[in-house]
């Protein structure tokens, strides 16, 4: 058993049929010595008396808010949560496996630049009685500070018969140099509590590996005389690290119709303009990627050909 | 347009070209190592990230773009240990900081070159003959060093009398390649910045 926060405790249980469970001793936070009784949740049934209560925790029925009283007055509370371990593996029932970039990916994180700010998100099908808390650091043995905000519900989607909820959190490394060469990864830890179930999820990464620039901005077209070719120009996104001659981007320019199966024109360039062939009912799209360290491409920025 | 439009300094341009070749060569070598040593811990997640130039050179600090010198977090360990003149820029343009930066890059390359050559000598003794360093990568390191044209003492190649542990050598190769790739990215950024300035 360990303390998650004040008056909230996590009991780690090996979860299998007829498991013996864990013996837990609760102590009432009071100078009083006698006349103390214990109850669980809203029940008035007295579970025991005395300053300490010893319980055998085997299942979710044994978890919950234990309260010690004296003469009708509440003295203190202890909330017990369960953390299940099945076949040596901690349960991951609360969050959905996003399976990208690999299986067992519950947390996904992205950074728009090298400033040390990043966003992580996760998915769940649970809509109520759900809380998250997020901690982060650079490295684990001698951790350096990363400050994370509160996790918020950022999107709701319908997937088949199920509703899916996306939560996200923004974090900022306390003293980040955009030009630094990372040797210790960022660690992100998410505590998830659903009713009386506790789970924790972690992710470890270098900012350089989660970079995904914003799409290029200000796409403009200039038709070339006596040709089917069009000059398309754009600018670096405002959120990208500066100076741009140091933090350079490379671009992919594509002309394509509505369907992915349609024919297309595609060209890669380090410049902020390119010449392509425009077709009726097609769009010109441009996306960006760090020129020197190939992490993710940005989303496309698009303008219609006509 | 956001990128500074500048006529490339003919003196700088060869270094930019060589640094691009360097990044390409080390990325290819790292990819080859990951594939060949698939049953060794050779991915970014599996290895310890060590920097053999730590406390010996100060490339990131010495080559910091002017725009980032206002960032306190970038100036923690700003050192000024190298004062030399390089040939990548016309000497009249070579400011003190730029000379410091380019000589720091040169020292990095020299250190990695020695490590790679020592390692290759060991790998050549491996009866499995599983992996060797790409001669192209070693040649590209040499070409960039020549383009930088700094004079410094020759670092003797480390020779080892004990029997090499090939497993450890291959893991060390992965560690070295990952670190060198990150440094090559920095070098490429620096050359691009200097070329545009």
């Amino acid at each position: 058993i360990w303390e998650l926060k004040k008056d909230v405790y996590v009991v780690e249980l090996d979860w299998y049929p007829d498991a013996p469970g864990e013996m837990v001793v609760l102590t009432c936070d009071t100078p009083e010595e006698d006349g103390i009784t214990w109850t669980l949740d809203q029940s008035s049934e007295v579970l025991g008396s005395g300053k300490t209560l010893t319980i055998q925790v085997k299942e979710f029925g044994d978890a919950g808010q234990y309260t010690c009283h004296k003469g009708g007055e509440v003295l203190s509370h202890s909330l017990l949560l369960l953390h299940k371990k099945e076949d040596g593996i901690w349960s991951t029932d609360i969050l959905k496996d996003q399976k990208e970039p690999k299986n067992k990916t519950f947390l996904r994180c992205e950074a728009k630049n090298y400033s040390g700010r990043f966003t992580c998100w996760w998915l769940t099908t649970i809509s109520t009685d759900l809380t998250f808390s997020v901690k982060s650091s650079r490295g684990s043995s001698d951790p350096q500070g990363v400050t994370c905000g509160a996790a918020t519900l950022s999107a709701e989607r319908v997937r088949g018969d199920n509703k899916e909820y996306e939560y996200s959190v923004e974090c900022q490394e306390d003293s980040a140099c955009p030009a630094a060469e990372e040797s210790l990864p960022i660690e992100v830890m998410v505590d998830a509590v659903h009713k009386l179930k506790y789970e924790n999820y972690t992710s470890s990464f270098f900012i350089r590996d989660i970079i995904k620039p914003d799409p290029p901005k200000n796409l403009q077209l200039k038709p070339l005389k006596n040709s089917r070719q069009v000059e398309v120009s754009w600018e670096y996104p405002d959120t990208w690290s500066t100076p741009h001659s140091y933090f350079s981007l490379t671009f992919c320019v594509q002309v394509q119709g509505k369907s992915k199966r349609e024919k297309k024109d595609r060209v890669f360039t380090d410049k902020t303009s390119a010449t392509v062939i425009c077709r009726k009912n097609a769009s010109i799209s441009v996306r960006a990627q760090d020129r020197y360290y190939s992490s993710s491409w940005s989303e496309w920025a698009s303008v219609p050909c006509s | 347009r956001n990128l500074p439009v500048a006529t490339p300094d003919p003196g700088m341009f060869p270094c930019l070209h060589h640094s691009q070749n360097l990044l390409r060569a080390v990325s290819n070598m790292l990819q080859k190592a990951r594939q060949t040593l698939e049953f060794y811990p050779c991915t970014s997640e599996e290895i310890d990230h060590e920097d053999i130039t730590k406390d010996k050179t100060s490339t990131v600090e010495a080559c910091l773009p002017l725009e980032l010198t206002k960032n306190e977090s970038c100036l923690n360990s700003r050192e000024t240990s190298f004062i030399t003149n390089g040939s990548c820029l016309a000497s009249r343009k070579t400011s003190f900081m730029m000379a410091l930066c380019l000589s720091s890059i040169y020292e990095d390359l020299k250190m990695y070159q020695v490590e790679f050559k020592t390692m290759n000598a060991k790998l050549l003794m491996d009866p499995k003959r599983q992996i060797f360093l790409d001669q192209n990568m070693l040649a590209v390191i040499d070409e960039l060093m020549q383009a930088l044209n700094f004079n410094s003492e020759t670092v003797p190649q480390k020779s080892s009398l004990e029997e090499p542990d090939f497993y450890k050598t291959k893991i060390k190769l992965c560690i070295l390649l990952h670190a060198f790739r990150i440094r090559a990215v920095t070098i490429d950024r620096v050359m691009s910045y200097l070329n545009a300035s």
Epitope: R228, R261, K263, T269, K280 | -
Partner: antibody
Framework: QVQLVQSGAEVKKPGSSVKVSCKAS????????LHWSRQAPGQGQEWMGW????????EYAPKFQGRVTITADESTSTAYMELSSLRSEDTAVYYC???????????WGQGTLVTVSS | DIVMTQSPLSLPVTPGEPASISCRAS??????LHWYQQKPGQAPRLLIA???QSISGVPSRFSGSGSGTDFTLTISSLQPEDFATYMC?????????FGQGTKVEIK
């Protein structure tokens, strides 16, 4: 299986014209760009131009502009390349090639040898 | 026009050995470079697109690298069927241009 089948070898006199055909099978003809290029003996490939069979748009290499005409007949899934004012240096194997991507070629025809000789 | 220069023009290789062919562009072409294989009397065959993207159905022993002006096609271990002419093609701008070809011969 996508295939491009070209017409047979031709011998032409200098100053005349040649028209080479390229019949496509497999896939929808108008879903692909169609290119023509040539390879003279002992030389590299030389790109001549492309056509979008969907709308008849064409683009030609400046070297061949005014001398080459690329057309397409959607009803027969056939593209044509006509080269006029032939000279001896036009002796080459002419290839048609296609792709959904405009700028490179994933399927080629078998080639048609055109010999220009007096 | 962008001029594509291949080297060497002829490359004698022992079967089972690796081979590397170089292609240089007269100006920077990013990764807009494609590789083809051509055997005598046959149509060219696409091997690599955009400098390093593998093509389905092409053996994994063929790989490409490079960007800017310098590109390399590598065959990790030459098989008897790999003896052919290899050519590069730039797609950075029109007119599309090809290298003159490198003939890989049995040593």
């Amino acid at each position: 299986q996508v295939q491009l089948v070209q017409s047979g070898a031709e011998v032409k006199k200098p100053g005349s014209s040649v028209k080479v055909s390229c019949k496509a099978s497999g896939g929808t003809f108008s879903d692909y760009y169609l290119h023509w290029s040539r390879q003279a003996p002992g030389q590299g490939q030389e790109w001549m131009g492309w056509i979008d069979p969907e709308n008849g748009d064409t683009e030609y290499a400046p070297k061949f502009q005014g001398r080459v005409t690329i057309t397409a007949d959607e009803s027969t899934s056939t593209a044509y390349m006509e080269l006029s004012s032939l000279r001896s240096e036009d002796t080459a194997v002419y290839y048609c090639a296609r792709n959904k991507e405009l700028r490179y070629f994933d399927v080629w025809g078998q080639g048609t040898l055109v010999t220009v000789s007096s | 026009d962008i001029v594509m220069t291949q080297s060497p023009l002829s490359l004698p290789v022992t079967p089972g050995e690796p081979a590397s062919i170089s292609c240089r562009a007269s100006q920077s072409i990013s990764i807009n470079l494609h590789w083809y294989q051509q055997k005598p009397g046959q149509a060219p065959r696409l091997l690599i697109a955009f400098a390093s993207q593998s093509i389905s159905g092409v053996p994994s022993r063929f790989s490409g690298s490079g960007s800017g002006t310098d590109f390399t096609l590598t065959i990790s271990s030459l098989q008897p069927e790999d003896f052919a002419t290899y050519m590069c093609q730039q797609s950075n701008s029109f007119p599309l241009t090809f290298g003159q070809g490198t003939k890989v011969e049995i040593k």
